[in-house]
């Protein structure tokens, strides 16, 4: 039997991708391993090769179909296995019955753009990517703004408790460079987590007009 501690964590992006990370203390770096997906009620199965991301963890993406195709539903269960080559055979190292809509992590929001900017405020919009139509409007967002001289970790989180793909940032300083990020999370799923943060959007507020404040 395998010794050491192990963790096998996967998330579904709600459309056609399951991303997995497997960590195993004492595992050999040069061992060839893969994740195999075996749905309970579908004719396909899928495999991806685990690639090292650190000393003792590996990751891969199970591509189930075209990016916007709805490959799984709320009733699906996919048995996921980590298989590692041991001589001439494949050995099962980890196994889980994966309920995709209980383990959601969406893609980061995309297409961030400044809709309107003034001296003290800025209106920003974005789009969600590869999100299932099943969610309808059952999504929430978190946003953060990077101010000069601060880090992202210090930035206060702004929560949008509904599917609102825009925000109006207020009380900004005139003629100042900022960066903005947003992430998304479905309300559904016991183990659902936030998407990665979007790519930062840089913007600059307008300078205050001489003698008056806009």
């Amino acid at each position: 039997a395998v010794n050491g501690t192990s963790q096998f964590t996967c998330f579904y992006n709600s459309r056609a991708n399951i991303s997995c990370v497997w960590s195993q203390d004492g595992a050999l770096q040069d061992t060839s391993c893969q994740v195999h997906a075996w749905p309970d009620r579908r004719r396909w199965n899928q495999t991806c090769e685990l690639l090292p991301v650190s000393q003792a963890s590996w990751a891969c993406n199970l591509i189930l179909g075209a990016p916007d195709s709805q490959k799984l539903t709320t009733v699906d269960i996919v048995t996921l296995r980590v298989l590692c080559r041991e001589g001439v055979r494949w050995r099962v190292m980890a196994i889980q019955d994966f309920k995709p809509f209980e383990n959601l992590r969406l893609m980061a929001p995309i297409s961030l753009q400044v809709v309107h900017v003034e001296t003290h405020r800025c209106n920003i919009s974005w789009e969600i990517s590869q999100a299932s139509h099943y969610f309808e409007r059952h999504l929430e967002f978190e946003a953060r703004t990077l101010s000069p001289g601060h880090t992202w970790e210090e930035a206060p989180l702004l929560t949008l408790k509904q599917k609102q793909e825009w925000i109006c940032l207020e009380t900004l300083t005139p003629d100042t460079q900022y960066e903005f990020q947003v992430r998304v999370k479905p309300l559904q799923g016991e183990f659902t987590t936030w998407s990665p943060w979007s790519q930062p959007l840089a913007f600059r507020t307008k300078p205050a007009a001489l003698g008056k404040d806009t």
Epitope: A1, V2, D40, T79, R91, A94, I95, Q96
Partner: nanobody
Framework: QVQLVESGGGLVQPGGSLRLSCAIS????????IGWVRQAPGKQREGVSC????????YYADSVKGRFTISKDSAKNTVYLQMTSLKPEDTAVYYC??????????????????WGLGTQVTVSS
Amino acid sequence: QVQLVESGGGLVQPGGSLRLSCAISGGTLDSYGIGWVRQAPGKQREGVSCMSRSDDRTYYADSVKGRFTISKDSAKNTVYLQMTSLKPEDTAVYYCAAVDAYGCSLVQPTTYDFWGLGTQVTVSS
């Protein structure tokens, strides 16, 4: 080679209880993911309950949730399945199975490496 031996099956009336045991020899219980799988006459094998080796997390089929409980005694190298509020549809041969991996599966019983010979459970009045 790991060997699994089930016991505790029998005839019980609807609403009754049974406790199945699975004694493991040739290996350490804590080294395996363990599952209970049943097969009714003319039906496919169905995962009933399993216990993950990595963290002792337990899983149950919807049909038995709240009625069956899986547990283990590492000192005795034995896994148990406590079955309560039994129904006629629970009638089946119950197998203990083990997989040399982290985690376990209810959905795909064929992933198990080692199997016992089974114990018959009959629920009838």
